[in-house]
Interface confidence: medium
């Protein structure tokens, strides 16, 4: 039977001559040669030779572990004359035996990472890895220990793990924000005589919210005009946060100050500044100056760093309103007088007044628009606004004047303003009452007494305040007439009344009454209508049949007596 | 002035995928943070999903209907975002918009949008 | 997940009209409450940030106020421009809408 066990050879053998492997021996083998040893396998006749004769084993070539750890060969024993086998066939192994010639190798160069300022001290910032090619069941030759060459005292690595954490307290990203750390893997469990390799990591510390916003300047000062629409931009101010992205982030906005009802501040987006602005129409005469408090905060708080005070900061703001010269201001939107219309030339009506709202209190003169008086009718004294009439007025004519009165800076034309004059004509009773229309009216020849023919109706162009009042009467020439009579009714209409039985048209065929109409206002008014009478041939229910003159003619034409 | 202008919408089956590209104009890009935002015919709106800028880490969220089937990736050297929209549905079936997320957690600028049909 | 509660869902005015659209939180946001305008065919436009800031270059008639969980957004004289589609929005945790307020004519 065969006579070995598995054989062992160190790796990396650095002998001249052949490294001896081991001898393979068969209890048939009585040493005189009439034993053949055969060698077939792995690397059999090239990397593993064998003396026929002896059975020894060598190795031609140096050998490496790591390519290679387990050599499977067969071993032959025969009859070197017949050639046949003196021993069955058999398997054996050669294993490479491990030595310390690999270093740990990491898994990348370089390696990235980041991890939040002010974290709290073992922190992870993230887990490097070497490994080593040599053999992990047999000695430290792949034990590998993790240690920090460069990076404290801000960060450490454990040992065994290769977790990489911070090691110091309140590390500030506004102070630095990149580290370079060196991470070495040593293998022998780190002991003397080791191999080892390194590897970078490249830390970055990641923006918190540990910085408030701080304006670099206690107050501002800006101008604007008391013109400025709302809306205007008047001014900027930034303050600033030493923190980055949304940690910085600023909002604006005014917290105190009498002005926090007229301005506003807005924040500008692409440039963190806060924008003043006018909120509400300015006015020079009533403030020159504003007084605003305005705060800057943080948005995005982290509530772990409220204990380094408010995140936020106060300014003030002084906002300096400059003066804009403004056209005269008049005492009312609109003026309304009122004139009697028997007003004489040069009558003053009434008056306006406007002035200077500028500081400077410019005088004003004032002036008619005559585009809007085309007629002349109004003047205005130029100094004291007094409006006189130039001509004379008619209230039926025209009830209401409407004017502009025009009021000019002297000192600067450019500056003027203008207001409505209405200007209302007060009735006078200067006009007669009349007829309403012209009246003709008939009588039947068969007429009897007391029989009214005709109502009278008045009108009047005056408008007095307590109403018409007419009254009528025949004129004194024909107030004793026997044929017609008046009857006033007192409600401004009267009746032609018959005062006789039957009329004649052969001997009269027209009458003409004159009749007075007065008014009841001061001074009285009153003028003298005529009504037409026709004596006229009737049927039996009084209708008209004919009105023909036939009777015969006074000289003068038709009679006047009633 | 500010400019948003998304482009890639189109009719696609269910299971498909899709690319929105939204080129950005007017403003410093690389320092804003940019949203999704979608509208079904007819419906209100939606957040899509968010990526943040380069000083916040290029940090992205998005709402549970999309997680995991929408990426959202920027280009600042291009002034373009995009969202690459994969295993459709038909319920994906809107406008997409895309919104310049202001400071205070506000859309101050938007695109006109861009529809997107799921259709079989 | 924050919800928004918005209403009315819609409304009718006339021009001139004041308007007031309530949103409410199913939790407390602080002040991170944004109100938005949309008309049909358009993307949304910011009209109020944080509760009561108003947006540059929206009216002042547009006014929004609250805090914690109830915001209000007012339009105190209402014009024909302003018929739309309002939203509100939170901010507090990542973002959801409310649902919308339709401003119609009367």
């Known amino acids: 039977s065969w006579m070995w066990n598995q054989f062992f050879l160190l790796e990396e053998y650095t002998g001249s001559d052949y490294q001896y492997v081991g001898k393979l021996h068969s209890d048939q083998d009585r040493g005189d040669g009439s034993l053949k040893y055969i060698l077939s396998g792995d690397g059999a006749g090239d990397l593993f030779i064998i003396n026929e004769n002896t059975g020894d084993i060598q190795a031609t070539k140096r050998l490496d572990r790591e390519e290679k750890p387990v050599y499977i060969l067969r071993a032959q024993a025969v009859n070197r004359r017949t050639g046949r086998p003196v021993e069955p066939e058999s398997e054996f192994i050669i294993k490479i035996h491990d030595i310390n010639d690999n270093e740990p190798i990491f898994t990348k160069d370089v390696y990235t990472a980041t991890v939040p300022e002010m974290a709290d001290v073992g922190t992870f910032v993230v887990q490097v890895t070497a490994t080593d090619a040599d053999d992990p069941t047999y000695g430290n030759s792949a034990k590998v220990v993790y240690s920090i060459l460069q990076g404290q005292p801000y960060f450490s690595v454990e040992s065994e793990t290769g977790i990489i954490k911070t090691a110091l307290l309140n590390m500030d990203r506004e102070n630095r924000e990149q580290y370079q750390v060196v991470i070495q893997a040593k293998d022998m469990g780190g002991q003397m005589g080791g191999l080892s390799g390194t590897t970078t990591v490249n830390i970055t510390l990641t923006d918190v919210n540990d910085n408030p916003p701080r304006f670099p300047q206690s107050t501002y000062q800006f101008k604007t005009p008391e013109s400025s629409p709302p809306g205007t931009p008047i001014g900027r101010i930034k303050a600033s946060d030493a923190d980055v992205g949304e940690n910085a982030e600023i909002e604006y906005s005014i917290t105190d100050g009498e002005g926090h009802e007229m301005f506003d501040v807005i924040t500008d987006q692409e440039t963190q500044e806060g924008i003043i602005t006018v909120k509400k129409l300015l006015d020079f005469e009533k403030k020159k100056v504003y007084t605003l408090k305005v705060e800057a905060s943080n948005p995005h708080v982290e509530p772990r760093f409220l204990y380094l005070g408010p995140f936020k900061d106060s300014a003030t703001v002084r906002i300096v309103v400059d003066d804009v010269d403004e056209p005269p201001v008049f005492s009312k939107l609109a003026y309304i007088l009122q004139i009697r219309e028997d007003a004489r030339i040069n009558t003053t009506i009434g008056s306006v007044a406007a002035q200077d709202p500028d500081a400077a209190r410019n005088p004003v003169k004032y002036s008619v628009d005559r585009h809007t008086d085309m007629d002349r009718i109004f003047n205005i004294d130029s100094g004291n606004g007094s409006i006189f009439t130039s001509k004379l007025l008619d209230r039926e004519t025209l009830l209401w004047h409407n004017i502009t009165v025009i009021a000019t800076e002297i000192n600067n034309p450019k500056q003027s303003s203008r207001v409505p004059l209405y200007i209302k004509v007060l009735d006078v009773n200067d006009n007669a009452p009349e007829f309403a229309e012209f009246y003709e009216t008939f009588v039947c020849e068969k007429a009897k007494a007391d029989q009214l023919i005709q109502t009278l109706r008045a009108v009047d162009k005056d408008d007095p305040y307590s109403g018409h009042q007419f009254s009528f009467s025949l004129a004194p020439e024909a107030a004793s007439s026997s044929n017609f009579t008046i009857q006033d009714n007192k409600d401004n209409t009267a009746g032609i009344l018959t005062r006789k039985n039957g009329y004649n048209r052969h001997e009269m065929s027209t009458y003409l009454l004159p009749v007075v109409i007065s008014d009841n206002d001061y001074p009285v008014q009153s003028s003298t209508g005529t009504v037409t009478v026709r004596v006229c041939a009737c049927d039996h229910h009084g209708n008209m049949q004919s009105c023909h003159a036939e009777a015969l003619i006074h000289p003068t034409g038709l009679s006047t007596g009633a | 002035q500010v400019q948003l202008v998304e482009s890639g919408g189109g009719l696609v089956k269910p299971g498909g995928s899709l690319r929105l590209s939204c080129a950005a104009s007017g403003f410093t890009f690389s320092s804003y943070a940019i949203s999704w935002v979608r509208q079904a015919p007819g419906k209100g709106l939606e957040w899509v999903g968010f990526i943040k800028s380069n000083a916040d880490g290029y940090t992205t969220n998005y709402a549970a209907p999309v997680k995991g089937r929408f990426t959202i990736s920027r280009d600042d050297s291009k002034n373009t975002l995009y969202l690459q929209m994969n295993s459709l549905k038909t319920e994906d079936t809107a406008v997409y918009y895309c919104a310049r997320i202001r400071y205070f957690r506000n859309w101050d600028y938007w695109g006109q949008g861009t529809l997107v049909t799921v259709s079989s | 997940d924050i919800q928004m509660t918005q209403s009315p869902s819609s409304l009718s005015a006339s021009v001139g009209d004041r308007v007031t659209i309530t949103c409410r939180a199913s939790?407390?946001?602080?002040?991170?409450l944004n109100w938005y305008q949309q008309k049909p065919g358009k993307a949304p436009k910011l009209l109020i940030y944080r509760a009561s800031n108003l947006q540059s270059g929206v009216p002042s008639r547009f006014s929004g106020s609250g805090s914690g969980t109830d915001f209000t957004l007012t339009i105190s004289s209402l014009q024909p421009e302003d018929f739309a589609t309002y939203y509100c929005?939170?901010?507090?945790?990542?973002?959801?809408f409310g649902q919308g307020t339709k401003v119609e004519i009367k």
């Open positions: 939790q407390t946001i602080n002040s991170y």
């Open positions: 929005q939170q901010g507090d945790s990542s973002w959801t």
